[in-house]
């Protein structure tokens, strides 16, 4: 019996087609992805093949103005239109709190939403009961397939799930649910979830009875043969893991941003064992036409976005200096504003020991593309912020050793004076450079704001200590020459859309007046 699994993950609000790098589509003839194009391909496969499941491994939420405005209603609507069969909860599904998940998505989805390792307690337990499930048995043709869901246990550090959801260890939580499916005579089981490729592989290895793992969170691109675009494969598709009980378990993921549709064919024997698996992600490029009905509906929904982008978010009573003449040479108040917003967006998980789990921000000055003049009545709009941060990136959470941070700050000024983009703006950091010294030895003082303290203060950076830092995904991926970050980071979790972070902060503060205050000397 053959099953076709179509899968997406980490779509992050890319409802419209995008450019090849998943930013705003400029030249339509070279654009990719989007739900209208995805629909065309999915329908084509459904017509051609008998047993097709369409699955999503989480993080539909967060990433463009679509999510900012529609807050998840757009996800439910278009996923319903595509007739998804199941979705696993990702960490970003909690970005607007539990209510922001329940109302727009859980109550509106016409497909099961899954996570076996999230347990509700207290007053939330009855409110959310039945709205998401640990597993679902889906009839497919003349057979049944069990889908069991999982979500990153780091979600409380990455999003806003509140205090009434407990995120258990994935493997510990999955095993009893898989065992339950076995007792229900379900012998074909897919683990669908959002914990990253390393955890996906562990699930394949450790959870007895899981036949296939469909993952997300790490934006992993797997491919067999010559890859069709810029993404470099992290391994073959499917990636085969040998389980502890000797089975070959295929593990798949489909990069991110709706650029590819994962396509996996699995052959099962009559006892539900995987006989063979093969496939590849399908690049959703312009050779696949956008479905006209979906496209027309996208255009209808778009109208509200255009209106939103010119509305006032808040006011500034000072000039927001985002000029390259400032931000690539010295501390600039636009850099301070953005870093403050980045830290503010990550205020969560305080306890008796820690006032917050992260206190530091770094931001390449070259990523700040425009100032905002306060003389326009002080008004700040989404449109203004889109000029400052035009690349559609995210502000991510990484863990780095102090020694890596020191290298990053040396790189920041290794060719100072040439108006290059690697000059770092900061938050929660005081750095002193001596530019008379030779490149690679110019950082003379680097103090960082403590997190394990009741009164935050600046302490010297310790080379062997592990620190959490918020930074643009561009830097986490080694952009602007920050190869040391990419090579040496110990953990990387994707965060929220850059403009959304700053706009939320400005809306919260109402009036802003960021200063140049001696963070960089």
């Amino acid at each position: 019996w053959e099953l076709t699994i179509l899968h997406t993950n980490d779509v992050h609000s890319r409802l419209e087609q995008t450019s090849e790098d998943s930013s705003k589509c400029v030249n339509a003839s070279r654009c990719m992805g989007g739900v209208a194009r995805l629909f065309t391909k999915v329908q084509q496969i459904r017509r051609a093949e008998p047993n097709v499941l369409l699955l999503d491994a989480g993080d539909q939420y967060q990433g463009t103005i679509w999510f900012t405005v529609y807050k998840g209603a757009e996800v439910a609507h278009f996923m319903n239109a595509l007739r998804y069969d199941a979705m696993a909860l990702g960490n970003h599904e909690f970005d607007n709190g539990v209510e922001g998940l329940i109302e727009p998505l859980l109550k509106e989805a016409k497909f099961p939403i899954l996570s076996a390792n999230i347990k509700a307690k207290g007053p939330l337990a009855s409110q959310i009961s039945g709205l998401y499930l640990p597993y679902k048995v889906l009839p497919v043709g003349d057979e049944v397939v069990g889908i069991v869901g999982y979500t990153s246990k780091e979600t409380p550090f990455l999003s806003n799930p509140g205090t009434n959801l407990v995120f258990e260890d994935e493997i510990t939580a999955l095993q009893p649910e898989v065992d339950k499916l076995k007792t229900l005579n379900v012998n074909k089981i897919i683990a669908l979830g959002h914990s990253g490729f390393e955890t996906d592989k562990l699930i394949a290895q450790k959870v007895r009875g899981v036949d296939v793992v469909v993952g997300g969170h790490s934006n992993t691109f797997l491919y067999t043969g010559n890859p069709p675009s810029k993404e470099v494969p992290a391994g073959k598709y499917p990636f085969i893991v040998t389980s502890d009980d000797g089975r070959k378990v295929p593990v798949v993921q489909a990069y991110a941003f709706g650029k590819y549709l994962g396509y996996l064919k699995i052959e099962f024997d009559e006892r539900g064992n995987v006989i063979s698996s093969h496939g590849n992600p399908i690049l959703l490029n312009s050779s696949i036409p956008e479905d006209p009905s979906i496209k027309a509906d996208i255009n209808k929904w778009r109208i509200k976005l255009d209106n939103y982008s010119t509305q006032e978010l808040g006011k500034t009573i000072v000039y927001l200096d985002g000029s390259s003449q400032s931000c690539r040479f010295r501390e600039c108040n636009m850099g301070n504003l953005i870093c403050d917003a980045m830290i503010n967006n990550n205020l969560r998980h305080a306890d008796e020991m820690f006032w917050n789990h992260v206190s530091m921000c770094i931001l390449n000055g070259g990523g700040i593309r425009s100032p905002i003049d306060e003389r326009n009545n002080g008004t700040i709009t989404w449109e203004n912020l889109a000029a400052v941060l035009p690349f559609g990136g995210t502000f991510d959470l990484v863990q780095l050793k102090g020694s890596t941070l020191k290298k990053a700050f040396e790189h920041s000024v290794h060719r100072y004076g040439q108006s290059t983009g690697e000059f770092l703006q900061v938050g929660g950091i005081h750095v002193v450079y001596d530019l008379s010294r030779k490149p690679g030895d110019r950082v003379v003082k680097l103090d960082v704001l403590c997190t394990k303290c009741r009164v935050p203060s600046y302490d010297p950076l310790k080379m062997d200590e592990i620190y959490k830092v918020i930074l643009p995904n561009f830097l986490a991926n080694g952009g602007d020459g920050f190869q040391m970050i990419k090579d040496e980071l110990l953990r990387h979790d994707s965060g929220d859309q850059d403009i959304n972070v700053v706009s939320t902060y400005i809306s919260k503060m109402k009036v802003i007046y960021p200063a140049v205050e001696g963070r960089i000397k």
């Epitope: 319903n80 069969d85 009839p139």
Partner: antibody, heavy 119, light 108 residues
Framework: QVQLVQSGAEVKKPGASVKMSCKAS????????MHWVRQSPGKSLEWIGY????????TYNPKFEGRATLTVDTSASTAYMELSSLRSEDTAVYYC????????????WGQGTTVTVSS | DIQMTQSPSSLSASVGDRVTITCTAS???????LHWYQQKPGKAPKLLIY???NLASGVPSRFSGSGSGTDFTLTISSLQPEDFATYYC?????????FGAGTKLEIK
């Protein structure tokens, strides 16, 4: 043109089962969900459930879960509904209905199958 | 479940009259997923208006729909003889899908 043609009227005894068919034509059968709705004499419309023809995935109204079974034969572009453990209150006209994929309205209706449950 | 309450349950009117039928949902329904059907005796229902206010193909412009949240209306601006029928509202904003009990429009 797009149409749904349903099987003929049935008379059944309480406790029995009935299986009715709905043949689709004029469109790609797998592209649209097929719903089943019933209407008791002089009453309103009541939704039973739907099936995704491309993979036979089903969603039921909890009221009919376990008693209604929806199936398809894609090669024949035909949907089926079986209702078991019939009782007199199941006497109704049963419609198969195609739904729009974007806004889930019912744009094409079958002519209906009359089921009479009587001892 | 979302209950859909239609009023009136029946209505007598004359050709040329303006008629309004209301549909009240027990909880908020997105206007995108609120639809109206017309049914004549012995026939299957027929789609009349979809997504609150959009006329289905071939439906005369004397029919219109409006509303949001929990309150929706179907209006016939000038009744014609062929409009005498039963009208149903329907939501599939949330599962299970539900219909109103119907409004029977009769000739006075």
């Amino acid at each position: 043109q797009v149409q749904l043609v349903q099987s003929g009227a049935e008379v059944k005894k309480p406790g029995a089962s009935v299986k009715m068919s709905c043949k689709a034509s004029g469109y790609t059968f797998t592209d649209y969900n097929m719903h089943w709705v019933r209407q008791s004499p002089g009453k309103s419309l009541e939704w039973i459930g739907y099936i995704k023809p491309h993979n036979a995935g089903t969603t039921y109204n909890p009221k009919f879960e376990g008693r209604a079974t929806l199936t398809v034969d894609t090669s024949a572009s035909t949907a089926y509904m079986e209702l078991s453990s019939l009782r007199s209150e199941d006497t109704a006209v049963y419609y198969c209905v195609r739904s729009d994929f974007l806004y889930w309205y019912f744009d094409v209706w079958g002519q209906g199958t009359t089921v009479t449950v009587s001892s | 479940d979302i209950q859909m309450t239609q009023s009136p349950s029946s209505l007598s009117a004359s050709v040329g009259d303006r008629v309004t039928i209301t549909c009240t949902a027990s909880s908020s329904v997105s206007s995108s997923y609120l639809h109206w059907y017309q049914q004549k005796p012995g026939k299957a229902p027929k789609l009349l208006i979809y997504s609150t206010s959009n006329l289905a193909s071939g439906v005369p412009s004397r029919f219109s729909g409006s509303g949001s949240g929990t309150d929706f209306t179907l209006t016939i601006s000038s009744l014609q003889p062929e409009d005498f029928a039963t009208y149903y509202c329907h939501q599939y904003h949330r599962s299970p899908l539900t219909f109103g009990a119907g409004t029977k429009l009769e000739i006075k």
